[in-house]
């Protein structure tokens, strides 16, 4: 049994880091493998992660962490029974994938303005709380070409757009994702999408 693709890990910079790797053949990850991880810190204890299958030869493990500090470094040991298959290390702050924003809501009752709001996925005491920026994706269910991205570079989790920038009388969907420039993170997954019917009063044409 050998590791074909070494584990790569990403952290949500809060409580979970996810590591994925591939074996050289079909593997029952949860019964055959264990991933041990330990914070490099005096008296810290080793923890064991039981991996799950992720395709025939792929494995994925969700490492639980109390919290993350940017200087943290973890040792990782991948075991198959008594055999050490791979040894490495992981610095969560250098491989951050933020949590996806939640509670995306479209408020359509503001005069001809669409207000989209969502929740910051981090608590106020987390470093990323004040460092997230967002991308909002709005698309038409009827017209695949009607697809747009709005970059929200301020901290407030909201976006205002004029309803008239979208077509009237049809349904739209929106979703939002996040990233943090300070840690050069990857983008988060998209939030669940929300749907609304766009309608607004056309201004009277002047002849």
């Amino acid at each position: 049994m050998k590791v074909l693709q070494e584990p790569t890990c990403v952290s949500d910079y809060m409580s979970i880091s996810t590591c994925e790797w591939k074996m050289n053949g079909p593997t029952n990850c949860s019964t055959e493998l264990r991933l041990l991880y330990q914070l490099v810190f005096l008296l810290s204890e080793a923890h064991t992660c039981i991996p799950e299958n992720n395709g025939g030869a792929g494995c994925v493990c969700h490492l639980l962490m109390d919290d993350v500090v940017s200087a943290d470094n973890y040792t990782l040991d991948l075991w198959a029974g008594q055999q050490l298959l791979w040894k490495g290390s992981f610095k969560p702050s250098e491989h951050v994938k933020p949590r996806a924003p939640g509670n995306l809501t479209v408020h359509t009752n503001v005069s001809d303005t669409l207000l989209l709001t969502w929740s910051n996925p981090y608590p106020p005491d987390n470093y990323l709380y004040n460092h997230l920026t967002y991308a909002v994706n709005i698309w038409s269910e009827n017209d695949p070409a009607d697809f747009r991205i709005y970059n929200v570079t301020y901290l407030e989790p909201s976006l205002r757009i004029a309803a008239s920038t979208l077509k009237s009388g049809i349904s739209y969907r929106a979703r939002v994702r996040a990233w943090a420039q300070c840690y050069n993170t990857t983008w988060s997954e998209w939030s669940p999408s929300t749907k609304w019917h766009n309608s607004y009063r056309e201004p009277f044409e002047q002849h």
Epitope: L39, D66, V69, A71
Partner: antibody, heavy 120, light 110 residues
Framework: EVQLQQSGPVLVKPGASVKMSCKAS????????MNWVKQRHGKSLDWIGT????????GYNQKFKGKATLTVDKSSSTAYMELNSLTSEDSAVYFC?????????????WGQGTSVTVSS | DIVLTQSPASLVVSLGQRATISCRAS??????????IHWYRQKPGQPPKLLIY???NLESGVPARFSGSGSGTDFTLNIHPVEEEDAATYYC????????FGGGTKLEIK
């Protein structure tokens, strides 16, 4: 209210041993590490070692290995430090201080200190 | 082992002015922004008191005139405006496999 109550001052002869205590109250004893720090008169702070009361695991500053022994009694929420083969260099104030892994070892509550004087 | 050098060794600052204390590590103690650096204040006859943990986080009950910053090998404690009760010796601390304290900076208020 969190308190770390240390045992009183001691005067000991060179070559002897001393065991001092640090009784914790106002929090769950096993949730925090206990650290011991030495301070000679007018000098900086010198970390001696750390013990995890939950499992008794210890970590020592290399220069105090063989000099200091850290133990705990969970039933009385008390940490102990024994110093052996005492010399005048061991005359100092010794502090116990708790710390939390989440804070990466920052010591947020300290005992009042135990003064040790080594003299013949 | 990491050695922490504090400067200056002593400092005289006028009431209401800014006090800046530096702590330099012999090698980098952080990866990207924050290291395991903590700051303490000690008054004569008393145990040290935690002021700032993890470089820049203010300990509960510590006035907002205290602030910490830095990364890599250089860390700073700022006190502004300085008050009379701030006269004390200040220590930085680094923790990883070992716990190390700086030599201390004695702050006097005039």
């Amino acid at each position: 209210e969190v308190q770390l109550q240390q045992s009183g001052p001691v005067l000991v002869k060179p070559g002897a041993s001393v065991k001092m205590s640090c009784k914790a109250s106002g929090y769950t004893f096993t949730d925090y590490y206990m650290n011991w720090v030495k301070q000679r008169h007018g000098k900086s702070l010198d970390w001696i070692g750390t013990i995890n009361p939950y499992n008794g695991g210890t970590g020592y500053n290399q220069k105090f290995k063989g000099k200091a022994t850290l133990t705990v009694d969970k039933s009385s929420s008390t940490a102990y430090m024994e110093l052996n083969s005492l010399t005048s260099e061991d005359s100092a104030v010794y502090f116990c201080a708790r710390s939390l892994l989440r804070r990466r070892g920052a010591m947020d509550y300290w005992g009042q200190g135990t003064s040790v004087t080594v003299s013949s | 082992d990491i050695v922490l050098t504090q400067s200056p060794a002593s400092l005289v600052v006028s009431l209401g002015q800014r006090a800046t204390i530096s702590c330099r590590a012999s090698k980098s103690v952080s990866t990207s922004g924050y290291g395991y650096i903590h700051w303490y204040r000690q008054k004569p006859g008393q145990p040290p008191k935690l002021l700032i943990y993890l470089v820049s986080n203010l300990e509960s009950g510590v006035p907002a005139r205290f602030s910490g910053s830095g990364s890599g090998t250089d860390f700073t404690l700022n006190i502004h405006p300085v008050e009379e009760e701030d006269a004390a010796t200040y220590y930085c601390q680094h923790i990883r496999e070992l716990y190390t304290f700086g030599g201390g900076t004695k702050l006097e208020i005039k």
